[in-house]
Interface confidence: low
């Protein structure tokens, strides 16, 4: 279409489509407007990834995607004169970015990370099939709160798995958790194919175990009061309370979704403290309690990782066997 083309005509393709990588896994495509576009055309750009996913119609000449670069990713871009999605865009121009070179069998596998108590991240992986046993691994990580890519210092081996931990402390009153951590594992010698992962901070969060503060009996109920792990607010957690009775040898597990300290028997105004009443507990027998917590979906997307169990606390008397 020449300079006098009607806006409904198909526009020329975009020019100078290029791709680059920022940080570890932020892929950025940029392009220039088409040459010879209709002068009375308000240009919009239609783009989608190779699998026709994430379609977007926008006036910006830029698109970015946070993606683990373990496989090739392509973006197709076309121009059009309106925001009408049914309008046929120009010929689509495609630009791809391929993962770093290397033998796919040499890349590490099962690369995954857990954010422990919102204070440090622990990543682990298995060696690739085609790697020598003395491979020196190195892990790089990046988060929006960091000025630059960092290297994880202490690589350790635990059984078949390699791993590394680095400090990543949740910052209060910020959008810290709304951004992911970008991870790359490779080796010092550059012999293996790098492996990437993107860890959303709203997932894979494992709290520390809670700390039981007090057990008491009131009107046939066992009142349990505990302190939540640091860094968490109680509305972001689910709880499980386990009570073992020595006499009946019963083992009861209670799922607690609300754990408010409303009763006068509970110690009041204790920050980050939760409470639960276990019904029908015999006070003249020994009852052993432990608690674990996990994040709930109101605060975190992933609610699968339970903390370890708390230390046990007991109340009551163990009856003599006579």
């Amino acid at each position: 279409g020449g300079g006098g083309a009607a806006p409904t005509e198909t526009q020329p393709p975009v020019t100078n489509l290029s791709v680059s990588v920022e940080n570890l896994c932020t892929v950025i495509w940029t392009w220039n407007p088409p040459e010879g576009a209709s002068p009375n055309c308000s240009l919009w750009y239609f783009s989608h990834f190779g699998d026709k996913q994430d379609k977007k119609l926008a006036p910006e000449t830029r698109r970015s995607k946070e993606v683990p670069l373990n496989e090739k990713i392509c973006l197709q871009v076309g121009s059009q004169c309106s925001t009408n999605e049914s309008e046929k865009p120009s010929i689509l121009v495609e630009k791809c970015i391929s993962p770093p070179e290397g033998d796919p069998e040499s890349a590490v596998t099962e690369l995954q990370c857990i954010w422990h108590n919102l204070s440090y991240m622990q990543c682990s992986w298995l060696p690739g099939r085609n790697t020598s046993p003395d491979t020196n691994y190195t892990l790089y990580y990046w988060h929006r709160s960091l000025e630059k890519i960092r290297q994880c210092e202490e690589i350790y081996k635990e059984g078949q798995y390699f791993g590394c931990s680095f400090d990543l402390t949740k910052v209060k009153d910020s959008s810290f958790e709304q951004h992911s951590v970008q991870i790359m594992v490779k080796d010092y010698a550059g012999k293996i194919k790098p492996s990437f992962n993107i860890v959303p901070l709203t997932s894979r969060v494992k709290p520390d175990p809670p700390h039981i503060k007090n057990l008491s009996f009131h009107n046939g109920d066992l009142h349990v009061q505990w302190e939540n792990p640091q860094n968490f607010i109680s509305r972001c957690l689910f709880y499980e309370v386990e009570v073992n009775n020595s006499q009946t040898e019963t083992h009861n597990v209670f799922s607690v979704q609300e754990a408010k300290c409303q009763n006068p028997e509970f110690e009041r105004n204790v920050e980050n403290t939760s409470c639960f009443m276990v019904p029908g507990v015999l006070p003249d027998t020994l009852n052993t309690v432990r608690i674990r917590v996990k994040t709930n979906k109101l605060c975190y997307e992933d609610d699968k990782l339970w903390s370890n169990w708390s230390q046990e606390m007991s109340i009551g008397k163990k009856r003599n066997s006579t």
């Epitope: 009153d173 959008s175 951004h179 609300e258 408010k260 605060c299």
Partner: antibody
């Protein structure tokens, strides 16, 4: 459709008590914060406080701490803003608004005009 | 306590012109907690931008937000008649004092 519907305008005398309401619909009421924002005549917006209806956790701006009480009844998807003793300076438009965890107010009620005059 | 200062207090422009509104924080803040609102007389505010640069649902693309640290900007690329209103920036517990965009 997300909606926040506030109770009607109120005319009160200084020293009187008042409780205004904000009923949420079209979304999971317990999964979002509800905030209250004051706008005095001809003035800007002031953040008063928020409540998380799921557990009634509240947070107040230091300027409003002790001056008002924010509460919620999740069984009827309603949040409240109340005064035990109104002052003439409480005359303002009060808005409730839904707040996702990142702190912006994405849906607003229509506002409740409170007039305190002797 | 963080203070948000908006400038200018009033912006006099004609339809079709570009409007640039500034919001300065007294200390560095997380960009993802910075929001912009529009309020017209007799109406409730409306969320335009959250997270400093993300447009809220249904907001035309002539509105854009940018900035980080202490300096944030709301840009209206071409003013439409319905855009003349008061604009507020907000970061969690704090609102700016507002910028009035009026017809020149």
């Amino acid at each position: 459709e997300v909606q926040l519907v506030q109770s009607g305008a109120e005319v009160k005398k200084p020293g009187e008590s008042l409780k205004i309401s904000c009923k949420g619909s079209g979304y999971s009421f317990t999964s979002y914060w509800i905030g209250w924002v004051r706008q005095m005549p001809g003035k800007g917006l002031e953040w008063m406080g928020v409540i998380y209806p799921g557990d009634s956790y509240t947070r107040y701006s230091p300027s409003f701490q002790g001056q008002v009480t924010i509460s919620a009844d999740k069984s009827i998807s309603t949040a409240y803003l109340q005064w035990s003793s109104l002052k003439a300076s409480d005359t303002a438009m009060y808005y409730c608004a839904r707040m996702p965890n990142w702190g912006s107010f994405d849906y607003w009620g229509q506002g409740t005009l409170v007039t305190v005059s002797s | 306590e963080i203070v948000l200062t908006q400038s200018p207090g009033t912006l006099s422009l004609s339809p079709g012109e570009r409007a640039t509104l500034s919001c300065r924080a007294s200390q560095s803040i997380s960009s993802s907690y910075l929001a912009w609102y529009q309020q017209k007389p007799g109406q409730a505010p409306r969320l335009l931008i959250y997270g400093a640069s993300s447009r809220a649902t249904g907001i035309p693309d002539r509105f854009s937000g940018s900035g980080s640290g202490t300096d944030f900007t709301l840009t209206i690329s071409r003013l439409e008649p319905e855009d003349f209103a008061v604009y507020y920036c907000q970061q969690y517990e704090t609102f700016g004092q507002g910028t009035k965009v009026e017809i020149k």
